[in-house]
C-alpha cells in the first residue's frame, strides 16, 4: 500500500523511496503508530524468569511479566528480583508480592 499523507500505518514501515508501506513480519517485528520507520521495531523476547503474557504482533510488542514470587522494579526494569519472604522484626506485611512490586511492610503500631 502507499503511505497516507507521507506516513505508514501501525504494522508497517516505509520503503526507502518513501513510496510504499511494507508490512512488519508477524512474531519478528512490529510498529505501534503511524510512522516513517525504515524498519519495523524488533520484538522483545521474554527472559528466563519471565512469562509471556501476550505475543508480539505486527502492531504490538511482546508483553512479558515476572514469574510468581518475583517482581520488576522501576529502577531496574531489566531484571526480575525475588520478593522477600517476610517482613523484618517489628514490621507487618500490608501488601503481597506482585509481578511489579515486592511485599509491602509497615512498622507495627506500638
Amino acid at each position: 500500500s502507499s503511505p497516507s499523507e507521507g506516513l505508514c500505518p501501525p504494522g508497517h514501515h516505509i520503503s526507502e523511496d518513501g513510496r510504499d508501506c511494507i508490512s512488519c513480519k508477524y512474531g519478528q517485528d512490529y510498529s505501534t503508530h503511524w510512522n516513517d520507520l525504515l524498519f519495523c521495531l524488533r520484538c522483545t523476547r521474554c527472559d528466563s524468569g519471565e512469562v509471556e503474557l501476550s505475543p508480539c504482533t505486527t502492531t504490538r510488542n511482546t508483553v512479558c511479566q515476572c514469574e510468581e514470587g518475583t517482581f520488576r522494579e522501576e529502577d531496574s526494569p531489566e531484571m526480575c528480583r525475588k520478593c522477600r519472604t517476610g517482613c523484618p522484626r517489628g514490621m507487618v506485611k500490608v501488601g503481597d508480592c506482585t509481578p511489579w512490586s515486592d511485599i509491602e511492610c509497615v512498622h507495627k503500631e506500638s
Epitope: S4, E5, G6, L7, G18, W34, L37, L38
Partner: antibody, heavy 119, light 106 residues
Framework: EVMLVESGGGLVKPGGSLKLSCAAS????????MSWVRQTPEKRLEWVAT????????YYPDSVKGRFTISRDNAKNTLYLQMSSLRSEDTAMYYC????????????WGQGTTLTVSS | DIVMTQSHKFMSTSVGDRVSITCKAS??????VAWYQQKPGQSPKLLIY???TRHTGVPDRFTGSGSGTDFTLTISNVQSEDLADYFC????????FGGGTKLEIK
C-alpha cells in the same frame, strides 16, 4: 527558498504550558511531513514530534508522549507544538523541520525558538 | 533506541587539510544516516543523506561514507568557513543524533 520561522518561546515555570508556532514559506507546506526537533543547552539534539502532511497522523518519543501535541494548519502554512506539564529537562532551542523528498529525513530547519523551564 | 556515538567531541585541523569525522551506531542502520553542519549561532544544515548522497548546494569537499554501524564524514581541502559542529543522525528507527564533533581551525 524554503523558509521556516519559529516563534512563541519564552520562560515558563515547571508544570506550565506553552504553544510554539512555525510559519512556513517557499514550498508547498501541505505536501510535506513536518517535525519538531530540540537542542539542549549542551547541544544535544532530540527528535520531539512528527506529523503527517495532512495533519491526520502524529507520533512522538516516549520522553514527551502525553505532554506535547503537534498540529498544523495547512491553510495558514503553520506548524504548532503545544507543550504542557513542562519540566526543567524540556529547556532547549526548538526547531521546526521539514522531511525532504525521498530521503526520509530532515532537509531544512528553522532558526529556532528558545524555551526555558525554570522556577 | 539506537545510540549514535561520535567519539571525538573536538577535532582540530588547518586550512587546506583533510579531516574525517566518525560516527558509530549501536546497531545496524543500513545507510540511513545523515550528516548536519551547525555553524555558531545558526540552525543545523543538511550536508549528506543516505550515508553518502550530497544535499543540494553542498560543496564536493564534503563526502560521506559507511554502512551498517560505522560512518564517516570527510572534509577535504578544509576552509575557514567549515568551522562548525557536525552531527550524525540515524533515521532507520525514529531519529537519534550523535553528540556532535566541533571542528576547530588552527
Amino acid at each position: 527558498e524554503v523558509m521556516l520561522v519559529e516563534s512563541g518561546g519564552g520562560l515558563v515555570k515547571p508544570g506550565g504550558s506553552l504553544k510554539l508556532s512555525c510559519a512556513a514559506s517557499g514550498f508547498t507546506f501541505s505536501s510535506y511531513v513536518m517535525s519538531w526537533v530540540r537542542q539542549t543547552p549542551e547541544k544535544r539534539l532530540e527528535w520531539v514530534a512528527t506529523i503527517s502532511s495532512g495533519g491526520s497522523y502524529t507520533y512522538y518519543p516516549d520522553s514527551v508522549k502525553g505532554r506535547f501535541t503537534i498540529s498544523r494548519d495547512n491553510a495558514k502554512n503553520t506548524l504548532y507544538l503545544q507543550m504542557s506539564s513542562l519540566r526543567s529537562e524540556d529547556t532547549a532551542m526548538y526547531y521546526c523541520a521539514r522531511r525532504g523528498d525521498s530521503m526520509i529525513t530532515t532537509d531544512y530547519w528553522g532558526q529556532g525558538t528558545t524555551l526555558t523551564v525554570s522556577s | 533506541d539506537i545510540v549514535m556515538t561520535q567519539s571525538h567531541k573536538f577535532m582540530s585541523t588547518s586550512v587546506g587539510d583533510r579531516v574525517s569525522i566518525t560516527c558509530k551506531a549501536s546497531q545496524d542502520v543500513g545507510t540511513a544516516v545523515a550528516w548536519y553542519q551547525q555553524k555558531p549561532g545558526q540552525s543545523p544544515k543538511l550536508l549528506i543523506y543516505w550515508a553518502s548522497t550530497r544535499h543540494t548546494g553542498v560543496p564536493d569537499r564534503f563526502t560521506g561514507s559507511g554502512s551498517g554501524t560505522d560512518f564517516t564524514l570527510t572534509i577535504s581541502n578544509v576552509q575557514s568557513e567549515d568551522l562548525a559542529d557536525y552531527f550524525c543522525q540515524q533515521y532507520s528507527s525514529y531519529r537519534t543524533f550523535g553528540g556532535g564533533t566541533k571542528l576547530e581551525i588552527k
